[in-house]
């Protein structure tokens, strides 16, 4: 007898997932500076808003080049688990002001949840670490006030603007190697 | 086509040793991670263990820690599992399997028995 | 004793919708983890049937779908026909054992 049959092929491959988590990361990265703006415009910031329970930035300029798959995977999907957490939290404890944006805000938190399914599917075929999607997250209170959630809002969209433009870059970079 | 195809399975004695082989081809073997996973006779599936696309990252079942050894040479496509002190329980049809896993061969029956 | 539970058996008459369930702990479905399912028919080798909790490689067809809710998963299968006659497993990775854990497996059988 011949060799066995074999089979055909899945709807994609680590190459496409890849590809796939590219284009998803930058139609995100448009997203975020879209409703960014928005914010500003509704509500302009006095000044840069940080939220201690944010992420730090996982790369600059200077580290792209020495990035290596596993850690730009592992970092990206823990990072954007706790922006996809930050925005449902904002979704739920936003005041009436905020409450004009809740479409947008919607979209954004299930292309974030795509994206971090995209990542994790590209994680399992690789055979990479992977990091627990649900890790314990940091307790967040309700914001002080109305003002309060607005400049968490902007410290949300800000952060999520410059890690989706370094993950853009990355997952670029990592094209290259795979 | 995706092709997985399993080799060096056999009659072995409790102690003894066995590698199987898997010969992959019809995808980008170096970019997928892979897997054996086994199956007692009558009895459900059971992974043994992966190594990542590149090989940097390994990981066992506790049933084979120590004694099994995963290893992958991507410029010949294949995929290999080394097993050492065999035992009865080992008995079982190994697959190979590529990804998620996505694919899977056709299996080569392993038969530990004095 | 396998790490996801399933059912040991199903049945089902031809046309009928049956569904299998697969339930898992904290460090594989409830840790967020993607859900998949494979079919076995007698004597082949298992065949990746849905991934990512609810997509279907190509070639399977619609009447096969998933879904996933905390720590548990289930897979339909409607319209059910003969060809359906198999083993079907589900599988997670797991975060204790570094690796994809599978359920003990469904034997489904169509009646009549």
């Known amino acids: 007898p011949g060799p066995p049959a074999g089979s055909p092929r899945v709807s994609s491959d680590p190459r496409a997932d890849l590809d796939s988590a590219v284009l998803l990361t930058r139609s995100l990265l448009a997203d975020t500076r879209q409703l960014a703006a928005q914010m500003r415009d509704k509500f302009p910031a006095d000044g840069d808003h940080n939220l201690d329970s944010l992420p730090t930035l996982a790369m600059s300029a200077g580290t792209l080049g020495s990035l290596q798959l596993p850690g730009v995977l592992t970092r990206l999907r823990v990072d954007l688990m706790s922006y996809f957490r930050h925005v449902q939290w904002l979704r739920r404890a936003a005041g009436p002001s905020l409450k004009t944006l809740e479409p947008e805000l919607g979209a954004l938190q299930a292309r974030l949840e795509r994206l971090l399914r995209r990542l994790q599917l590209l994680m399992s075929r690789l055979a990479l670490p992977q990091a627990a999607p649900d890790q314990p997250a940091v307790p967040l209170g309700p914001p002080a006030s109305a003002w309060g959630s607005i400049r968490a809002a902007h410290a949300i969209l800000g952060g999520l603007h410059l890690t989706l433009d370094w993950a853009v870059r990355g997952l670029l970079l990592l094209k290259t190697r795979l | 086509e995706v092709q997985l195809l399993e080799s060096g399975g056999g009659l072995v004695q409790p102690g003894g040793s066995l590698r199987l082989s898997c010969a992959a081809s019809?995808?980008?073997?170096?970019?997928?991670?892979m897997h054996w996973v086994r199956q007692a006779p009558g009895k459900g599936l059971e992974w043994v263990s992966v190594?990542?696309?590149?090989?940097?990252?390994?990981y066992y079942a506790d049933s084979v820690k120590g004694r099994f050894t995963i290893s992958r040479d991507n410029s010949k496509n294949t995929l290999y599992l080394q097993m050492n002190s065999l035992r009865a329980e080992d008995t079982a049809v190994y697959y190979c399997?590529?990804?998620?896993?996505?694919?899977w061969g056709q299996g080569t029956l392993v038969t530990v028995s004095s | 004793q396998s790490v996801l539970t399933q059912p040991p058996s199903a049945s089902g008459t031809p046309g009928q919708r049956v569904t299998i369930s697969c339930t898992g702990s904290?460090?594989?479905?409830?840790?967020?983890?993607?859900v998949h399912w494979y079919q076995q028919l007698p004597g082949t080798a298992p065949k990746l049937l849905i991934y990512s909790n609810n997509e279907r490689p190509s070639g399977v067809p619609d009447r096969f779908s998933g879904s996933k809710s905390g720590t548990s998963a289930s897979l339909a299968i409607s319209g059910l026909r003969s060809e359906d006659e198999a083993d079907y497993y589900c599988?997670?990775?797991?975060?204790?054992?570094?690796?994809?854990?599978f359920g003990g497996g469904t034997k489904l059988t169509v009646l009549g």
């Open positions: 399997a590529a990804g998620v896993p996505d694919y």
């Open positions: 599988a997670a990775w797991d975060d204790s054992l570094n690796g994809p854990v």
């Open positions: 019809g995808f980008t073997f170096s970019s997928y991670g």
């Open positions: 190594i990542s696309y590149d090989g940097s990252y390994k």
């Open positions: 904290s460090s594989n479905i409830g840790a967020g983890y993607d």
